[in-house]
Interface confidence: medium
Amino acid sequence: LPAQVAFTPYAPEPGSTCRLREYYDQTAQMCCSKCSPGQHAKVFCTKTSDTVCDSCEDSTYTQLWNWVPECLSCGSRCSSDQVETQACTREQNRICTCRPGWYCALSKQEGCRLCAPLRKCRPGFGVARPGTETSDVVCKPCAPGTFSNTTSSTDICRPHQICNVVAIPGNASMDAVCTSTSPTRSMAPGAVHLPQPVSTRSQHTQPTPEPSTAPSTSFLLPMGPSPPAEGSTGD
């Protein structure tokens, strides 16, 4: 005979656990239904009645199957200089990220408290390490035989073109100039770019089975450009 399907609430067999999307209620000592994402437990279960769930109110959410008494608050509204990459819904927190070309320089668990513009490497310097969501660009001087003639947070040092006859030797900030009509080898025209970091700020997710901390959102401090660092400019 097939095993009888138990309907919540039910007392679990000794040593067994509750099924998926159920939780064990210590007070009722029964397996009871969890509430679906976008809902919360309005009334906890008893020995004779199952969990009563209710929809999350505006500006609150639950991301997982849960039995929390109230939904979690969505994070603060994104500031004017931030990008809202995920809206606050009943099932997910708002996510704010630093706008393109910026990175998070000061953060807490709630998210980014300070977005700062990515450092730009000035001519004669190239990007040694590209910026990420949480780290600035690192610039390095162009080594002999390479140059960068741009002020950029993405351009690396490029090799000088090799001439049959050099009219003007290249330096760290300028390519070589050839006298012949066609150099022996030249780079493809245009600067070499490193990809911009893509903002995909990870969020703190609800722990299970005891949700105690809210997923975070990110925040921006509007600010001016960074002062120049060695080999960089804040322009």
Partner: antibody
């Protein structure tokens, strides 16, 4: 306008606990931090910790871990600080203050303070 | 922890003159071109009041005779000209990292 209203003065016996309250109004309570600061008579200011009411996340000065417990009630826009195992060293004025998550990142509005006296 | 050292501990200035208070941090409180140093005024019997945030920004409603300057580890609060209502204790505070810390305070008096 932003206001933080703190509970009245407390007289407590050594070894007991007190729970101070700080009711916020004039802004979205869950959007910013509530900080707590201690000031002993004639002394300077000491940061105890802060709570983000939106999530309940707390940050403590190591010196006050085990002494202070910060909580918040979103429904009443009230932050609480419980001080336990009181000694004479805990006699002080305790301030709550708001600190914006972004912007100033400073304590721009303060409660009037709650005086706690520990005496047998 | 970042230690903030204020000097002088007390200061007597004539009305209309300039008062300068210094705050030195044990390590830099700068991050990406911002200095996370703030200045507060506390009149006896009252809570502190924010005067200057992030080193040099004047808080709304604070008179322009208050100004802040500095970067990294050395910061200054200037009151020019000093008025009778400025008698108070002034504190610097950093919020670059937990635990947030305050300076020991500078008591301003009128001579």
């Amino acid at each position: 306008q932003v206001q933080l209203q703190q509970s009245g003065a407390e007289l407590a016996r050594p070894g007991t606990s007190v729970k101070l309250s700080c009711k916020a109004s004039g802004y979205t309570f869950t959007d910013d931090y509530i900080d707590w600061v201690k000031q002993r008579t004639g002394q300077g200011l000491e940061w105890i910790g802060e709570i983000y009411p939106g999530s309940g996340n707390t940050y403590y000065n190591e010196k006050f871990k085990g002494k202070a417990t910060l909580t918040a009630d979103k429904s009443s826009s009230t932050a609480y600080m419980q001080l336990s195992s009181l000694t004479s060293e805990d006699s002080a004025v305790y301030f709550c203050a708001r600190s914006q998550v972004y912007g100033k990142i400073a304590m721009d509005h303060w409660g009037q303070g709650t005086s706690v006296t520990v005496s047998s | 922890d970042i230690v903030l050292t204020q000097s002088p501990a007390s200061l007597a200035v004539s009305l209309g003159q300039r008062a300068t208070i210094s705050c030195r941090a044990s390590e830099s409180v700068d991050n990406s071109g911002n200095s996370f140093m703030h200045w507060y005024q506390q009149i006896p019997g009252q809570p502190p009041k924010l005067l200057i945030y992030r080193a040099s920004n004047l808080e709304s409603g604070i008179p322009a005779r208050f100004s802040g300057s500095g970067a990294r580890t050395d910061f200054t609060l200037t009151i020019d000209p000093v008025g009778a209502v400025d008698v108070a204790t002034y504190y610097c505070q950093q919020s670059k990292e937990d635990p947030y810390t305050f300076g020991g305070g500078t008591k301003l008096e009128i001579e």
